[in-house]
Structure formats: C-alpha cells, structure tokens
C-alpha cells in the first residue's frame, strides 16, 4: 500500500480468482484513543471500533472511502484504491490502445518544435468518475523540471456503438535549449484514476523524435505567363524554431486532381517555393518535415488550383 | 530520406554538401544496422545514449546560431571566440564563424573516425560476419575532415589484443551510430546556418 | 473455490459451425479476463483468444482470427467461443482459463472437425 | 504458432537434478514474466510456477524457475516418478494484451 495523495492510498494486488488479497492496517487520524468507530462509504454499518482498522483487501468491493467517527462526529477519511497486477502486467482498463505508431501506445505526444513544449493525448470510453494528474521529467534517476498543466477534455467522437473521450495536457521543459542534443528522455506518467481503480501510464520519448511541424503558411500560387505551370510560394510556420536557417524544413508539394484515384504529383524541395503544373479542379498542397531529422510530417496547407 | 536530393551550388560554403552527405551516410548505415541486428538491441528505445565527445569538445555550444546565445539554457559552458582558420570559412566573414565551432567539429569526426575503425576492425573477425561499417561513411568523414582542413595530431587506433566480444562490438555500434547521427544532424544545420551568414 | 465446467464440444464437418461454453463458479465472474487454449492431439498447447473481465476488447491468435469469436455473459457467468468455417487442423481439446498469476483451467472439451 | 522453444525430452534417474530450458526473445521472456505447467496424461495442464520463480502453495519445493535475459528455466531438484509428464513453459507478447505463448513442451522420463 502506498500514498498518492493526502488520505488516498493506493493497494496492490495480485488479480486471480481466490487471490488471498492484501492485508490493510488503517489508523485513525486522531488524538483520541476510545470510542472510534469504523464504516465504509455511505454505509451505517459499523466495520470495527478502536484506533485501527485490519481489512483484507481482496475485491473492488473492499475497496472505498473508510471513515472513522466517534460519537456521530467524523474524525479521518481513508480513500482505498485497487491498482491490479494480472499475471506480472499492471491492468490498463481505463485508456484505450491507440496502436500507433505500435501495439500498447496508451499515451501519444507531440511537439511543433524545439522549445521543450509539448502535447499528450490519450484516449477512453469512460464518461464519468474519471480523474487524471501528469507529472513530467528529463530523465528518471536524476530528474530535471518539465512542468505540466491539468488534463482537459479535448475532443468527443462516436465510434461505433460507443463513445470516445480524448483528454490532453500541455508540458513545458522547464530549462530547454532548443539546439541542445538529447541524451536522456522525457518520462511522462499519468495517474488514472476510474471509480476505485488506480492505473499509471508511462512514455518516454525524445524531443526530436516527436516533432510534428505546423503546416507552411500563407499558401499562394503566382500563374506563370503564357504557361499552365503556377509559382507556389509559402512561408515558414510561426511555431517552428528559429532561426530557420538553423532549424531547416524541407517540404513536400503535391498535385491532387478532384478525385483521390487520380495521380498525384509530388515535389520534394528545400526552397520555400516550386512550379509545378496546376490542373483543372485540382488542388495544391504543401507540408513540411525536419530537414535534417526525419520525424513527422506535418498536416497539409492546401489551395485549389483555380 | 529516399527523396529527389538537388546537388549544392559549386559556388556554396564549401562544407555544407559534405556535411549533407555525411548524414545522409550515417543515416543510411544506422538503417542498415537496425534491419542487420534486429534481435540486438539497437533502437533508440534500447540502447543507452552515450556521447564519446561528452568532456572533450563543446559543438553544440560552440556553434550556438547568435539569436540563441539570449537563452540562457544554452549558455551552460559558452566560450565565443570569432577568429576562423579553417578553409571553410576562406570565403565567408562573418562575426558567427568561430574557429571554436569548427574546430570542435573536426574534433568530433576524428574521434568518431578512430572509434568506428577500431570497430570496423573488431567485425572483420568476427566468423558471423554479420555486420561492417560503410566504407563510403568512413570516406565522407574523411572528406569533411580534409573540408575543414583543421591541423591537429593524429589520434592511434585503438588496439586490443583481448578477444572481442562481438555481441558488445555489436550493442557499441549501434550506440555510437545513434549518436553520431545526432551530431551529423547538428553539423548539418551548423553548416546550414554558417551558408546562409 | 472455482470452478470452470465446459460443455460444447463434438464432432463436426469442414466449413461448419460449433458454440464452446465455459460455466464459472466459484469467484466474480465479471471481474477478471478469460482465455481459450487448445491442444491438438499428441501436440503442445496453443493460445486462442483472450476478452477482458467487461468484454471491452478480445485478441485472437492469427491461426483463428475472422473465424472464432470469444464472447462472455457476466449476468450468466459464461464464457463462449463461437467457432466458424472449421478445418481439420482445429480439431483439439480446447481449454477455457482464468487470466492472472494463479490461472484455473477447465476440464477441457473436444473439438473434431472431420468429414 | 509456438513462439518458446524447449528442448523436445529430458531425463533422469530418481534423486537427479532435471532441467528445462525455454528461449524466447525480447518480445516476450524478455520483457514478461514466464511460468510452467506440468501436464499429465489426459488432463488439464497444471501451475508449477509463475512470475518466473514463484511457486504455488501445494507445489513441492523440489521444482524451481529463473528467467535470465531471454530464456528461462525449470529445475526438478530430486526428480520423482510422479514428475514423470510433460511440462510447457509460458509467457506473454508485449505486442499484444492477453496474447499468451508457449513452450513447444518437453517430456519428462524417469528412468
């Protein structure tokens, strides 16, 4: 058993039918010595006297806010939490897997560029009784500052029959350099907690290996006279790093005809402009890329041809 | 990157097409080493990630683009200095160029350089035969290097006359891929920079 | 103390059906995640599918993906694994299992997929 | 399908020291915890071990696991005629929840 917050502790089990559980010593937080009673949540029923409390700890059912009183007056509360260990795995019930960019990805993040400021996101079902805390770090056995905000509600769908829930939470490396190499990683841990269980998420990941640059602004096409050719020019977006000759993008410029069978067309160019052939109906698109450090690409800045 | 790569202006900072093939090259061999040495653990997620220039030479300060020099999470161990003497800055003035930045690279690829054939040298004995190093890697170095045209002592291979252990060889080369890749990087957007002053 | 009571098995053509169950007791059936294996004859033993205590998520092993379906009912304390277009290579003892460190079999059913 | 590789048969006299080994690679042994079965003639496979070295209580301590790096493996310190059967070793695939592998099981003759 152990503390994640004040008055909230956290008990371990080993998760099989017929386990023998957890045995459970609680105190009462309290100068008093006599007349301590003992009841679990809502219920009257009276679980024990004295300034302590043993409980086997085998089931969701154990689980629960314990309080203890004397006289109708409540002296302490403790919340009991399950946290389930199935055969060596920690159980991960409450987040769904996002599969990407591999099997067991539960947290997903994200960068626009160097300055040590990035974007987490995971996803779940569960609508309600739901609480999530994030904590971050630069490496784990001597760790420096990243400081996160709270775990918002960013986004509803509906998949199927059900409903899905994407929470996200903005960190900050507290001293970053942007030019600096990384040598340990970012260690982001999110607490979870559904009803009475307890469940911790866990990714580590490089900066550089999570960037995902916005996409080119100010997207423009310049007909070139006498000619179906066009001059497609774009800027840098304003949340890449500066300066721009250090931190370099390449990008991609493609040709799409109105319909996603056709044939598209596509430039690679480290300039910040191309000619290329713009067809009736079609659409230009530009994205943008790491010159030098092959992470993501970003979303598509687009403009039809017309 | 397999993507259309144009070939730099004749009239360009000298250095910039070989420090772009020279991460190109690394790319390319730590790809190889990744597929070669599958059920080693060879990536990112696995490996330790040692820096053998850690204490030895300062690029990443030393080559500092100035609008970074106001973020003070980058002034840890800042020395500037603003005399140039190598032949890639024969054409260029401009008061970035330091001869700390580039000496500091030389540096780097000559240590990298006598690391990995010291490597090369353990994995030609191996019966597995399973893994070498890219002679065109090696020889972009070298071609950097000669770009730089830095005078400084030359460094002895390493000799060992103890039998490798070829499964550590292997695990050591990977480590020193990954992060001779992210100084490849930095090198890169250095020459970048210095071609755009 | 729990138990685990299939029931299901048989002969059975190529290409036809058959509903395995796996009758809990014993413990809270809707707690804990559930696993098929099977065990062809005189072979070793072979993983089939896993569903989680809610039936929120099932995983297949590729031998049997498309074909089998793992389901539960916590109101009836029942395991099931729905079994379509049947090969020969199917026919075996399968095994439905509790998931955790302490795992508690069932007696096993047979499975023969002949013509 | 068998993922785990053990040695096909191993034996021994009674009183001997027996074991099984089981490789795998870093997607399973490697980085999850590995258990045994006993299997006796004609019924359901039975937990000698789990979380590599842990043993059930009504196991005798005669049977032992470790798991290095990976591959794992069983001991019958003072084999018995009733060990006579055959055993499979166990572990999970870290690409996939639930996903269980198995041993491709190793039969246990006492001479």
């Known amino acids: 058993i152990w503390e994640l917050k004040k008055d909230v502790y956290v008990v371990e089990l080993d998760w099989y039918p017929d386990a023998p559980g957890e045995m459970v010593v609680l105190t009462c937080d309290t100068p008093e010595e006599d007349g301590i009673t003992w009841t679990l949540d809502q219920s009257s029923e009276v679980l024990g006297s004295g300034k302590t409390l043993t409980i086997q700890v085998k089931e969701f059912g154990d689980a629960g806010q314990y309080t203890c009183h004397k006289g109708g007056e409540v002296l302490s509360h403790s919340l009991l939490l399950l946290h389930k260990k199935e055969d060596g795995i920690w159980s991960t019930d409450i987040l769904k897997d996002q599969k990407e960019p591999k099997n067991k990805t539960f947290l997903r993040c994200e960068a626009k560029n160097y300055s040590g400021r990035f974007t987490c996101w995971w996803l779940t079902t569960i609508s309600t009784d739901l609480t999530f805390s994030v904590k971050s770090s630069r490496g784990s056995s001597d760790p420096q500052g990243v400081t996160c905000g709270a775990a918002t509600l960013s986004a509803e769908r509906v998949r199927g029959d059900n409903k899905e829930y994407e929470y996200s939470v903005e960190c900050q490396e507290d001293s970053a350099c942007p030019a600096a190499e990384e040598s340990l990683p970012i260690e982001v841990m999110v607490d979870a907690v559904h009803k009475l269980k307890y469940e911790n998420y866990t990714s580590s990941f490089f900066i550089r290996d999570i960037i995902k640059p916005d996409p080119p602004k100010n997207l423009q096409l310049k007909p070139l006279k006498n000619s179906r050719q066009v001059e497609v020019s774009w800027e840098y977006p304003d949340t890449w790093s500066t300066p721009h000759s250090y931190f370099s993008l390449t990008f991609c410029v493609q040709v799409q005809g109105k319909s996603k069978r056709e044939k598209k067309d596509r430039v690679f160019t480290d300039k910040t402009s191309a000619t290329v052939i713009c067809r009736k109906n079609a659409s230009i698109s530009v994205r943008a890329q790491d010159r030098y450090y092959s992470s993501s690409w970003s979303e598509w800045a687009s403009v039809p041809c017309s | 990157r397999n993507l259309p790569v144009a070939t730099p202006d004749p009239g360009m900072f000298p250095c910039l097409h070989h420090s772009q093939n020279l991460l190109r090259a690394v790319s390319n061999m730590l790809q190889k080493a990744r597929q070669t040495l599958e059920f080693y653990p060879c990536t990112s997620e696995e490996i330790d990630h040692e820096d053998i220039t850690k204490d030895k030479t300062s690029t990443v300060e030393a080559c500092l683009p100035l609008e970074l020099t106001k973020n003070e999470s980058c002034l840890n161990s800042r020395e500037t200095s603003f005399i140039t003497n190598g032949s890639c800055l024969a054409s260029r003035k401009t008061s970035f160029m330091m001869a700390l930045c580039l000496s500091s690279i030389y540096e780097d690829l000559k240590m990298y350089q006598v690391e990995f054939k010291t490597m090369n040298a353990k994995l030609l004995m191996d019966p597995k035969r399973q893994i070498f190093l890219d002679q065109n890697m090696l020889a972009v170095i070298d071609e950097l290097m000669q770009a730089l045209n830095f005078n400084s002592e030359t460094v002895p291979q390493k000799s060992s006359l103890e039998e490798p252990d070829f499964y550590k060889t292997k695990i050591k080369l990977c480590i020193l891929l990954h992060a001779f890749r992210i100084r490849a990087v930095t090198i890169d957007r250095v020459m970048s920079y210095l071609n755009a002053s | 103390q729990v138990q685990l009571v299939q029931s299901g098995g048989g002969v059975v053509q190529p290409g036809r059906s058959l509903r395995l169950s796996c009758a809990a007791s014993?413990?809270?059936?809707?707690?804990?995640?559930m696993h098929w294996v099977r065990q062809a004859p005189g072979k070793g033993l072979e993983w089939v599918a896993f569903?989680?205590?809610?039936?929120?998520?099932?995983y297949y092993a590729d031998s049997v993906k498309g074909r089998f379906t793992i389901s539960r009912d916590n109101s009836k304390n029942t395991l099931y694994l729905q079994m379509k277009s049947l090969r020969a290579e199917d026919t075996a003892v399968y095994y439905c299992?509790?998931?955790?460190?302490?795992?508690?079999w069932g007696q096993g059913t047979m499975v023969t997929v002949s013509s | 399908s068998y993922v785990l590789t053990q040695p096909p048969s191993v034996s021994g006299t009674p009183g001997q020291r027996v074991t099984i080994s089981c490789s795998g690679g870093?997607?399973?042994?490697?980085?999850?915890?590995v258990k045994w079965y006993q299997q006796l003639p004609g019924t359901a496979p039975k937990l000698l071990i789990y979380?590599?070295?842990q043993r059930p209580s009504g196991v005798p301590d005669r049977f032992s696991g470790s798991k290095s790096g990976t591959s794992a493996s069983l001991a019958i310190t003072g084999v018995q005629a009733e060990d006579e059967a055959d055993y499979y070793c166990?572990?999970?695939?870290?690409?996939?929840?639930?996903?269980?592998?198995f041993g491709t099981g190793t039969k246990v003759t006492v001479l």
């Open positions: 166990q572990s999970y695939d870290s690409s996939l929840r639930g996903s269980r592998v």
């Open positions: 014993g413990f809270t059936f809707s707690s804990y995640g």
């Open positions: 870093r997607s399973n042994i490697g980085s999850n915890t």
């Open positions: 979380g590599n070295d």
């Open positions: 569903i989680r205590y809610d039936g929120s998520n099932k």
């Open positions: 299992t509790t998931h955790g460190s302490h795992d508690n």
